[in-house]
């Protein structure tokens, strides 16, 4: 039962994270939560950074600055994949949840 619950939590978190990405950066509250998660967990996007390419409000040459290894204003524009976190947040945060929840 514990494994079923854990999988459900992960699935729910994945859906919720992707949903929040759709609102980025229009919703300031959502943006700050996602930015905090990406910066703190050193991750980018749900599965990986290319998830940001699918967000209509984000140009394909851009990821949030919080994806950058060294976060500075504007570092996510014309980014180089070598300078951003490549791991997705669902897997990264999911691992933390599995250990701690």
């Amino acid at each position: 039962a514990g494994y079923v619950f854990r999988d459900k939590v992960m699935s729910e978190f994945n859906n919720n994270f992707r949903q929040q990405m759709e609102n980025y950066p229009k919703n300031n509250h959502t943006a700050s939560i996602l930015d905090r998660m990406q910066a703190d967990f050193k991750c980018c996007g749900a599965a990986n950074y290319t998830d940001w390419e699918k967000i209509p409000s984000m140009s394909k040459n851009r990821v949030p600055d919080s994806c950058c290894i060294n976060v500075t204003v504007g570092c996510g524009i014309n980014f180089n994949e070598k300078a951003i976190h490549k791991e997705g947040c669902v897997e990264k945060i999911g691992g933390w949840l599995r250990k701690n929840v």
Epitope: E53, S59, K60, N61, D65, I77, N78, N80, E81, K82
Partner: antibody
Framework: EVKLVESGGGLVQPGGSLKLSCATS????????MSWVRQTPEKRLEWVAY????????YYSDTVKGQFTISRDNAKNTLYLQMSRLKSEDTAMYYC????????????WGQGTLVTIS | DIVLTQSPASLAVSLGQRATISCRAS??????????MNWYQQKPGQPPKVLIY???KLESGVPARFSGSGSGTDFTLNIHPVEEEDAATYYC?????????FGGGTKLEIK
Amino acid sequence: EVKLVESGGGLVQPGGSLKLSCATSGFTFSDYYMSWVRQTPEKRLEWVAYISSSGGSTYYSDTVKGQFTISRDNAKNTLYLQMSRLKSEDTAMYYCARREDYDGRLTYWGQGTLVTIS
Amino acid sequence: DIVLTQSPASLAVSLGQRATISCRASKSVSTSGYSYMNWYQQKPGQPPKVLIYLASKLESGVPARFSGSGSGTDFTLNIHPVEEEDAATYYCQHSRELPYTFGGGTKLEIK
């Protein structure tokens, strides 16, 4: 000294294919995103495509999407542009260029290779 | 796509005078405190060469007589004092989003 040398251009019939190459030297090729830009006979510049440093991500202008394929071989320090189903509108001088991170300027360009569709 | 409109299409300036070229974007190219506008010079038979990036930063090795200004949608390239070797075509280009686009060019003639 940074050098970019394009090759592979020529005269092709409409509907034909061509593969352009851009041999580079003088910098760590695998560290940079690379672009193809073309210049029409009327001298208009048009960004065509760019590719990420690893080659894992590619981006195209709507005018060439599904028709052109950008790729790279980091072991050979070479950039490629595979062009298919060529049309007269694709007649242009094709340049490869190095894109700089963050500001997106194109700092180094090759001398270009001419593609004529006729 | 962001459309860049350059004006004038051509201009003739006397040696030692000021040349001013404008570039207007159909949408703001400024974000995060930066303006993603670049300027290039192209001489016949040569590829374009970057002069100015991020609207006002001078590319290494480019003479200080070249300067760029502007933000949002309106940008300017100034050349002062103009020298013989500045006869060329000048292009603006934005790198704010994909696709990158270029202006139609301004041909500078030295009188």
